[in-house]
């Protein structure tokens, strides 16, 4: 889980190892702050929980791509 001790900067110190389906993911944000020890992606799930993930992992990149496309596609 993300850690916001030095609010308002949120950092990730550990990444999930588990692959998560895009079915559970609602949105994401990238963590690129120099105040954080590593670059990260924080996924927000459909039940509003936050998960730290490694942006170098393929499933994470695929999930971000999917969410980007979902955002671009207007709902009918």
């Amino acid at each position: 889980q993300p850690d916001a001790i030095n609010a308002p900067v949120t950092c990730c110190y550990n990444f999930t190892n588990r692959k998560i389906s895009v079915q559970r993911l609602a949105s994401y944000r990238r963590i690129t702050s120099s105040k954080c020890p590593k670059e990260a992606v924080i996924f927000k799930t459909i039940v509003a929980k936050e998960i730290c993930a490694d942006p170098k992992q393929k499933w994470v990149q695929d999930s971000m791509d999917h969410l980007d496309k979902q955002t671009q596609t207007p709902k009918t």
């Epitope: 889980q1 588990r18 692959k19 998560i20 079915q23 459909i46 039940v47 998960i51």
Partner: antibody, heavy 119, light 113 residues
Framework: QVQLVQSGAEVKKPGASVKVSCKVS????????MHWVRQAPGKGLEWMGG????????IYAQKFQGRVTMTEDTSTDTAYMELSSLRSEDTAVYYC????????????WGQGTLVTVSS | DIVMTQSPASLAESLGERATINCKSS????????????LVWYQQKLGQPPKLLIY???TRESGVPDRFSGSGSGTDFTLTISSLQAEDVAVYYC?????????FGQGTKVEIK
């Protein structure tokens, strides 16, 4: 493709504990979110618990809290479910179940392990 | 917890007839942002583990015959077998996967009349 192979049938006395194993192949266990579901004879499916990446930890159904422990041996890609203080109502087939990307449902199941609790 | 209630408990239809199973959730399992229902259907044959048939309430898993269809939204869902075959004799379960704890319906046994 994920494959799950469970340990064999067990007969236990009331009050004892049982430990069921589930060996993963095709994936490493740490990539998966392994869960356990049981089914008493002639009854329905009952989720017991499993690793929830949204919480970052193993979560348990309230009914089994304090009596069940789910662990992982990442060196052998084997998941374990230990149930203690067994009673006759715990007689059931116990399944490990998962999917390649955690979604909240299960498309890969072990073959099941029958645990019989009898004096 | 989200409680799942299935009906009927059992049903018997003739070969080639339609079989309909209902599943009701105590809370909505519709996520409005993507308009998807977080509900799956499983088929369990005697002595076997369950097999996933349908996810997102209406999307068939690959390899599942098209006589199986899922419908419904929010709290009320239906699994339909359009033309019952001998190999469809099984118990069918719904499960919500919107939020933990993951909960199942009590099952519907489908037999041939």
């Amino acid at each position: 493709q994920v494959q799950l192979v469970q340990s064999g049938a067990e007969v236990k006395k009331p009050g004892a504990s049982v430990k069921v194993s589930c060996k993963v192949s095709g994936y490493t266990l740490t990539e998966l979110s392994m869960h356990w579901v049981r089914q008493a004879p002639g009854k329905g499916l009952e989720w017991m618990g499993g690793f929830d990446p949204e919480d970052g930890e193993t979560i348990y159904a309230q009914k089994f809290q304090g009596r069940v422990t789910m662990t992982e041996d990442t060196s052998t890609d084997t998941a374990y479910m230990e149930l203690s203080s067994l009673r006759s109502e715990d007689t059931a087939v116990y399944y490990c179940a998962t999917n390649e990307f955690w979604s909240g449902y299960f498309d890969y199941w072990g073959q099941g392990t029958l645990v019989t609790v009898s004096s | 917890d989200i409680v799942m209630t299935q009906s009927p408990a059992s049903l018997a239809e003739s070969l080639g007839e339609r079989a309909t199973i209902n599943c009701k959730s105590s809370q909505s399992v519709l996520y409005s942002s993507n308009n998807k229902n977080y509900l799956v259907w499983y088929q369990q044959k005697l002595g076997q583990p369950p097999k996933l048939l349908i996810y997102w309430a209406s999307t068939r898993e690959s390899g599942v015959p098209d006589r199986f269809s899922g419908s419904g939204s929010g709290t009320d869902f239906t699994l339909t077998i359009s033309s019952l075959q001998a190999e469809d004799v099984a118990v069918y379960y719904c499960q919500q996967y919107y939020r933990s704890p993951w909960t199942f319906g009590q099952g519907t046994k489908v037999e041939i009349k």
